[in-house]
Amino acid sequence: KFSKQSWGLENEALIVRCPRQGKPSYTVDWYYSQTNKSIPTQERNRVFASGQLLKFLPAAVADSGIYTCIVRSPTFNRTGYANVTIYKKQSDCNVPDYLMYSTVSGSEKNSKIYCPTIDLYNWTAPLEWFKNCQALQGSRYRAHKSFLVIDNVMTEDAGDYTCKFIHNENGANYSVTATRSFTVKDEQGFSLFPVIGAPAQNEIKEVEIGKNANLTCSACFGKGTQFLAAVLWQLNGTKITDFGEPRIQQEEGQNQSFSNGLACLDMVLRIADVKEEDLLLQYDCLALNLHGLRRHTVRLSRKNPIDHHS
């Protein structure tokens, strides 16, 4: 009951709080349980006790073990245990489950991700935030005090978020990272059979031979974040990648927008240097979700150049 798991990475700072609470005036003694050896309070030590806090500055794998804290008052003693595990830094991007803090959920209206354990440290803004090891960039992400705010949250925002900050102790700086999963829950959303807004079914698009042309497939799937929604193009019933015409490419990455609260996606098909044979192809805009698939077909026709003599 009065035992707490704590973990950290080697060469980072780790600060652990005694699981037994007491008034600030109470003294707290810390011991390494395996040897019953007292933890020093002198700050010159790499591992030292500071009241209710046990500080590893920085932590080493060999520090792993169970630490005992005894909160002493004039009338009673309370004992707690801190089970500390220090892990080697991972060479790859994957953050293993044992380094994860509790998962948090967010929605369109509330998307705060708090940096775990940060209140134990002496840190100064700004926090750095990473998602799946990539630094977060863009106006949708705002590092605010000890948490991250994500604007216009969508399903794709789910993932593992890591905060990184610097702990300062007597002028010395130590790095700290902490990772937690973020899940996105739908608020009063709904899903419907895909509705393709563009192109219109059996639309004829005029193009000029030798010029570039863009076709946009745009569809809406319901309100709020959608678990499964995709738009893509096919040529003559074949995947773009399998069709084997390098001049015709699907734009990588689907743009998501919220139109009147509806979740919509679009995908651009780029045709470089339009050729006569492109006019013979059937271009299918496909929209897919959990309900099923909708298809709108487009064909190209030659745009007659303006006769400047008339």
Epitope: F193, A230, L232, Q234, G237, L286, L288, G292, R295, T297
Partner: nanobody, 121 residues
Framework: EVQLVESGGGLVQPGGSLRLSCAAS????????MGWFRQAPGKERELVAV???????KYADSVKGRFTISADNSKNTAYLQMNSLKPEDTAVYYC???????????????WGQGTLVTVSS
């Protein structure tokens, strides 16, 4: 219409692995996406994993990092590799596919009969 037949289900201990297969026949060239859904007793059917256009994959949060969906187009088969299985993964697993001829403007998912996965010690 696409016909789907699942295989590979069974009883496995927690922490164990299973590989489900889904063989598609019929109008297979028209398949745009294949997915695995599951339904536990007394619960709604939920999407576990989907592969779109043979390359884009999507997973339910509860299985991320443990399950992997893949497809072999030459065999018209989809697979679900399930590792680190938990008792809560116990369910009937259904394979589903969606596509349709180029003349069809709208089509729903086609379903297999399902295969039972039981995770228990």
């Amino acid at each position: 219409e696409v016909q789907l037949v699942e295989s590979g289900g069974g009883l496995v201990q927690p922490g164990g692995s299973l590989r489900l297969s889904c063989a598609a026949s019929g109008r297979t060239p028209s398949i745009i996406a294949m997915g695995w859904f599951r339904q536990a007793p007394g619960k709604e059917r939920e999407l576990v994993a989907v592969i779109i256009d043979s390359r884009t994959t999507k997973y339910a949060d509860s299985v991320k990092g443990r399950f992997t969906i893949s497809a072999d187009n030459s065999k018209n088969t989809a697979y679900l590799q399930m590792n680190s299985l938990k008792p809560e993964d116990t369910a009937v697993y259904y394979c589903a596919a969606v596509g349709g001829a180029t003349t069809v403007t709208a089509s729903e998912w086609d379903w297999g009969q399902g295969t039972l996965v039981t995770v228990s010690s």
